[in-house]
């Protein structure tokens, strides 16, 4: 019962998390104009992974897509890639976990197969969550770097009288959505992995018993061939799971002086 609850909860948490990752990826407010120097601006700028927008005080909003692919900063492309990989892995994980749910019966699927699928989906959720967290964190780091650079160059005097205020950008709502969603997906994945341990049946360790018949000296193990091959109708095999170690190449980023719009 506890295993079913853990698996179900893990699925629901991951589902919410992946929905959040998708929402964050689609949101336009990854970076928003910093209003510290001008809290009553009549023009408000914000940017997403796919387009940049300007909301006027009049209520008119205009968004322009980044129609170039090669002209965009590598870091932005990396963030896009991480978020898409996170969504794809999460979606596959959700699909696998639906069939792995203990409360859903599909044909004569054995518990061992369900356990295997639960672990697979759990690992996928963990990697998906990590991708989202990494993507959002890379973007946040990019913002912090650009923020302090533009702060240093904030006011450039023109003829000593005219001021040109450089627009600074700070964390947008999408970053927080992404961090929370990534965390939820990660937690959901861990819960699925925990549930998998409960789903995987314990193998009964039968001790080899020697029967001494008169005139014969034959020793055998109960179950015979069936027990060793696992082809018998009522046999259950113990699986050995290897999570594997994943290493990701580190991409060194050089702070860009300019925003990507």
């Amino acid at each position: 019962m506890a295993v079913t609850a853990c698996q179900g909860l893990g699925f629901v948490v991951s589902l919410i998390g992946i929905a959040g990752i998708i929402a964050a990826t689609c949101m336009d407010q990854w970076s928003t104009q910093d209003l510290y120097n001008n809290p009553v601006t009549a023009v408000f700028n914000y940017q997403g992974l796919w387009r940049s927008c300007v909301r006027e005080s009049s209520g008119f909003t205009e968004c322009r897509g980044y129609f170039t692919l090669l002209g965009l900063p590598a870091m932005l492309q990396a963030v896009r890639a991480l978020m898409i990989v996170g969504i794809v892995l999460g979606a596959i994980g959700l699909l696998v976990s639906i069939f792995a749910l203990k409360c859903i019966r599909i044909g004569s699927m054995e518990d061992s197969a369900k356990a295997n699928m639960t672990l697979t989906s759990g690992i996928m959720f963990i990697v998906s969550g990590l991708c989202a967290i990494a993507g959002v964190s890379v973007f946040a780091n990019m913002l912090v770097t650009n923020f302090w650079m533009s702060t240093a160059n904030m006011y450039t005097g023109m003829g000593g009288m005219v001021q040109t205020v450089q627009t600074r950008y700070t964390f947008g709502a999408a970053l927080f959505v992404g961090w929370v969603a990534g965390g939820l997906t990660l937690i959901g994945g861990v819960m699925m992995c925990i549930a998998c341990r409960g789903l995987a049946p314990e193998e009964t360790n039968y001790k080899a018993v020697s029967y001494h018949a008169s005139g014969h000296s034959v020793a055998y193990k109960p179950g015979g061939f069936k027990a060793s091959t696992g082809f018998g109708s009522n046999t259950k095999n113990k699986k050995i799971y290897d999570g594997g170690a994943r290493t990701e190449d580190e991409v060194q980023s050089y702070p860009s002086k300019h925003d990507y719009v």
Epitope: Q33, N38, V40, T41, A42, V43, N45, Y46, Q47, S52, C53, V54, E56, S57, S58, G59, F60, E62, R64, V162, Q163, T164, V165, Q166, T167, D259, V261
Partner: antibody, heavy 118, light 113 residues
């Protein structure tokens, strides 16, 4: 046809109060931010206050802050400007205007004259 | 606050002449997000409310004759009337539409020579 009709002006004593109205018609009033702009006799235009479509954002000119209150009734398609502690320098023609793209004001009321004098 | 400075304060012209008036802002009105300049031009005839001519520094409002042209970027802006008509002889105001408080220039008055 878009129309903005100003009313409520008149002669007021210094320190007195007045409430100006702006009745809108010919457009969906609740979709637009609105402004009050004034013009002293033989002088230029001076922005007074702004209110967003849903009244969530309100801005005032520094000289009007604390004395003037902008409000709107979307059900009645009406914009208001409550003026208190009036001074002689508040004597002007008061216009309401509709706020549109480019943060520009495309339609203006005909104006209502407020004279502050003892 | 952004200070708007219009020059000249008055201009004497003849009908059919090309007229140029200037508007300078104390801060850049160029928005980096959409590369648009938030400057608006209005025309005001005596006894009438102002009329919108140009927004985003160069976008003509619908119904405005094409003899009116707005140009400029950052802090320096210009309103040009290619061939002045009798009905154009009035006052023109520029306005900062970038930051609150919204500020107007003192105006340029066109007068007949």
């Amino acid at each position: 046809e878009v129309q903005l009709v100003n009313s409520g002006g008149g002669l007021v004593k210094p320190g007195g109060s007045r409430k100006l109205s702006c009745a809108a018609s010919g457009f969906t009033f609740s979709d637009y931010g609105m402004h009050w702009v004034r013009q002293a006799p033989e002088k230029g235009l001076e922005w007074v206050a702004y209110i967003s479509s849903g009244s969530s954002t309100i801005y005032y000119a520094d000289t009007m802050k604390g004395r003037f209150t902008i409000s709107r009734d979307n059900a009645k398609n009406t914009l208001f400007l409550q003026m208190t502690s009036l001074r002689s320098e508040d004597t002007a023609m008061y216009y309401c205007a509709r706020f549109v793209r480019g943060n520009s004001m495309d339609y203006w009321g005909q104006g209502t004259s407020v004279t502050v004098s003892s | 606050d952004i200070v708007m400075t219009q020059s000249p304060s008055s201009l004497t012209v003849t009908a059919g002449e090309k007229v140029t008036m200037s508007c300078k802002s104390s801060q850049s009105l160029l928005n980096s997000g959409n590369q648009k300049n938030y400057l608006t031009w209005y025309q005001q005839k005596p006894g009438q409310p102002p009329k919108l001519l140009i927004y985003w520094a160069s976008t003509r409002e619908s119904g405005v004759p094409d003899r009116f042209t707005g140009s400029g970027s950052g802090t320096d802006f210009t309103l040009t009337i290619s061939s002045v008509q009798a009905e154009d002889l009035t006052v023109y105001y520029c306005q900062n539409a970038y930051s609150y408080p919204l500020t107007f220039g003192a105006g340029t008055k066109l007068e007949l020579k």
